[in-house]
């Protein structure tokens, strides 16, 4: 008799999940010499321990604490780049501007980026069929709790001027329900963070509007100001040129507005 299995609304665990996490860990420690001491098998064991044999709607931050301990890493607190709905450009930027960091440039973020995972209560199996959807099933699922945990701690670690890249092509440039809007904004520490600087990335080539005047950006400014953090905003009218100028700041065309 086949065992009854809970059907969730979201996609199942990414295929070859254990192998992927382990391989990413090894690759990361090879690329980052300061992390070469990390025991990737222990990292995988801690990751697995956070969700295996546990009900996938009953995961807590505490479940990930052993993994957090193993992922200890130096991140310059004044070089943090947050992003919302514009991950690819943020990552392209930090690949060029190597002294700045998104969460996915850290070991823990790198391990989990774009992956899905969940287990089943009382069995050691990984569920490759389906996993809980944040909206339709439950918010305390393994993936959501992981990102909430690391995002909160990443924001808490930030200091001085914190940058955030926002997608100017979306109807809500600042979305209160995004990870940035619901977690990171509220965990910036006013005693450490002086300014949040938003970079609003334009999508259209002929779009010359000042998106820093968008109502959702004003909402962000209000939230940040109430937390005693200064706010500034810049339009990035041409993201392609922006990246090019990060690569080659001496280029004569890089003195004009981008």
């Amino acid at each position: 008799v086949p065992r009854w299995r809970q059907q969730w609304s979201g996609p199942g665990t990414t295929k070859r999940f254990p192998e992927t996490v382990l391989a990413r860990c090894v690759k990361y420690t090879e690329i980052h010499p300061e992390m070469r001491h990390v025991d990737c098998q222990s990292v995988w064991d801690a990751f697995k321990g956070a969700f295996i044999s546990k009900h996938p709607c009953n995961i807590t931050e505490e479940d990930y604490q052993p993994l957090m301990k193993l992922g200890t890493q130096t991140v310059p607190c004044n070089k943090i780049l947050l992003w919302s709905r514009i991950k690819d450009l943020a990552h392209q930027f930090t690949q060029v501007q190597r002294d700045m960091f998104t969460l996915e440039d850290t070991l823990l973020g790198y391990l989990a980026d774009d992956l899905t995972w969940c287990g089943e209560f009382n069995t050691s199996k990984i569920n490759y069929q389906s996993c809980p959807d944040w909206r339709k099933d439950c918010s305390n699922n393994p993936v959501s709790v992981f990102w909430k945990t690391v995002s909160r701690r990443f924001a808490e670690a930030a200091c001085d001027v914190v940058h955030v890249m926002l997608n100017g092509s979306r109807s809500k440039i600042f979305d209160k329900n995004s990870t940035f809007g619901s977690v990171e904004v509220h965990n910036l520490q006013p005693e450490k963070v002086q300014t949040l600087e938003a970079w609003v990335i334009h999508g259209g080539r002929e779009d010359s509007r000042d998106l820093c005047q968008d109502p959702t950006i004003k909402e962000l400014e209000s939230i940040i100001s109430k937390r005693n953090i200064q706010f500034s905003c810049k339009n990035i009218y041409r993201p392609d040129k922006f990246l090019q100028c990060v690569k080659n700041p001496e280029d004569s065309s890089c003195t004009s507005e981008i």
Epitope: M68, K69, G71, T72, Q73, T74, V75, P76, C77, N78, T106, L108, V150, R153, F154, E156, A157, C159, Q189, E191, K192
Partner: nanobody, 117 residues
Amino acid sequence: EVQVLESGGGLVQPGESLRLSCAVSGFTFSNFAMSWVRQAPGKGLEWVSGISGSGGSTDYADSVKGRFTISRDNSKNTLYLQMNSLRAEDTALYYCADGTGPFFDYRGQGTLVTVSS
């Protein structure tokens, strides 16, 4: 600006004890969880112990559990690490840092603990 000053390190024999201190300024100390992290020669950063802002909650790396005790005196803006039954593998530069990790940007110079016979 957040500033920390670690002290109390030194050369001890295996089995002996040390008490590290960390004086903190630049923010409201009691508002922040704090941690001790360490870096052994030629090794990476290792989280050692953490404590909540009130001091009511503590946590330890498995490698130091039962031997090390973290504490804080919020009236003195000072964090402590009592290290007993020291081992050669505890040899490292010890830093204090705000937060519970895993992301740290330590501001101090650290204090060197050497355990050797």
